[in-house]
């Protein structure tokens, strides 16, 4: 059902990275506008992005209230300039999104190596703990705050002079690895959430190499 001149939204898709969460849909509107509603399974509907001509709506503010909840969104279509108009059933045309559970489904953003420090034959590599838009007590939480030990980082490292890679893991944001004295190494990290079955991994961080600005070298 629905008003003549309006078409229902379709291809409703959640795009979410480190909890920044946007609902996208089609089609580009012609003589119509959209309003989005979001709800938890047991909660009330909340309207967002009122009468917009966009085909996306940022729902981050809603989902960060409880990232472990499962959310459902719907997109209403209204004729442009006549938003009071409803369909033959007395309802505006709408389409439901797939369910979305941020904690299980948000993509892990590309991590960044914050620093590395060599002390003798040990190197300490630190991964930046990215801030999310999830809040607790008026403070933005980091990725580590939200995921705790569920979040693992894998370090890849190799001698600048060789292609043979080694790897190590941590459930903190720091690695302490053994290296050969007098050799320069390159590093890259990947975030992983082992308990997930999909969206488990991030893309690899940019490569950082010793002998460049990021690190610090101390011969002991």
């Amino acid at each position: 059902s629905g008003t003549t001149n309006t078409v229902a939204a379709y291809n409703l898709t959640w795009k979410s990275t480190n909890f920044k969460t946007i609902l996208e849909w089609e089609p580009k509107p012609v003589n119509q506008v959209y309003t989005v509603q979001i709800s938890t399974k047991s909660g009330d509907w909340k309207s967002k992005c009122f009468y917009t001509t966009d085909t996306e709506c940022d729902l981050t503010d809603e989902i960060v209230k409880d990232v472990k909840q499962t959310y459902l969104a719907r997109v209403f279509s209204y004729p442009a300039g006549n938003v009071e108009s409803t369909g033959s059933a007395g309802e505006p045309l709408y389409e439901n999104s797939p369910e979305f559970t941020p904690y299980l489904e948000t993509n892990l953003g590309q991590p960044t190596i914050q620093s590395f420090e060599q002390v003798g034959t040990k190197v300490n590599v630190t991964v930046e703990d990215e801030r999310t838009l999830v809040r607790r007590n008026n403070t933005f939480l980091s990725l580590r705050d939200v995921f705790g030990k569920d979040l693992i980082y894998t370090l890849y490292y190799w001698k600048s002079s060789s292609s043979g890679k080694k790897t190590a893991k941590t459930n903190t944001n720091e690695f302490l690895i053994d290296v050969d004295k007098g050799e320069n190494y390159c590093f890259s990290v990947q975030a992983v959430i082992p308990s997930r079955t999909v969206n488990r991994k991030s893309t690899d961080s940019p490569v950082e190499c010793m002998g460049q600005e990021k690190g610090e070298f101390r011969e002991i």
């Epitope: 693992i152 190590a168 459930n171 082992p194 969206n199 991994k201």
Partner: antibody, heavy 117, light 107 residues
């Protein structure tokens, strides 16, 4: 259900090459590394290396660098291990396994490779 | 490389007995340790991950403890089907080495 099914036994001559396949099903192939290990009475279980289907990255145990090559076919969710210049001491049962980062939770049935003249 | 040393190499125990096997890492690996059971002619089977967590479908008579260098696997009451070789593996840093195994037999 999750399965890793390996190719059949191989009898090869010293100096030859062999390719073992590991066809996976029942899970998202790109989300889990595929590990390779081998087992022999003389050396127990030895880790060979792994390949990450998400980014194609390979990590090898030092002794296998240059000897082994790990590869993938995304269209069939299959991992491959090729071993070159085989010696008698490469006689072993070779296993692939799915890596969940904290452990290897599903294993192939094993492929027996015998190097004999 | 991190060496994993299991002891004792072989154990003989009676049905219903409590059995403990140990695994020692040559350097600290936090809780990056897994335990496997392997029966003759079969693939290894995951028992424990992250040092203390029981894998899906593993009977509650199995438990594990440890962190750092020192780890142990305990069978609270030995069953006939527990006859197997048990392996520990560190998954902290490559190469991801295995112990040499503990062979468990019924006395």
């Amino acid at each position: 259900q999750i399965q890793l099914v390996q190719s059949g036994p191989e009898l090869v001559k010293p100096g030859a090459s062999v390719q073992v396949s590991c066809k996976t099903s029942g899970y998202s192939f790109t989300d889990y590394n595929v590990y390779w290990v081998r087992q022999s009475p003389a050396k127990g279980i030895e880790w060979i290396g792994y390949i990450d289907p998400y980014n194609g990255l390979t990590i090898y145990e030092q002794n296998f660098r240059g000897k082994g090559t790990l590869s993938l076919d995304h269209s069939t969710s299959t991992a491959y291990m090729e071993l070159n210049s085989l010696r008698y001491e490469d006689t072993a049962v070779y296993f692939c396994a799915r890596d969940v980062t904290t452990a290897l939770d599903f294993w192939g049935q094993g492929t027996s490779v015998t190097v004999s003249s | 490389d991190i060496q994993m040393t299991q002891s004792p190499a072989s154990i003989s125990a009676s049905i219903g007995e409590r059995v403990t096997i140990t695994c020692l890492a040559s350097q600290t690996i936090d809780t990056w340790l897994a335990w496997f059971l392997q029966k003759p002619g079969r693939s290894p089977n995951l028992l424990i991950y992250a040092a203390t967590n029981l894998a899906d479908g593993v009977p509650y008579r199995f438990s594990a403890s440890g962190s750092g260098n020192d780890f142990s696997l305990t069978i609270s009451s030995l069953n006939p089907e527990d006859v197997a070789t048990y392996y520990c593996q560190q998954v902290y840093s490559s190469p991801f080495t295995f112990g040499q195994g503990n062979k468990l037999e019924i006395r």
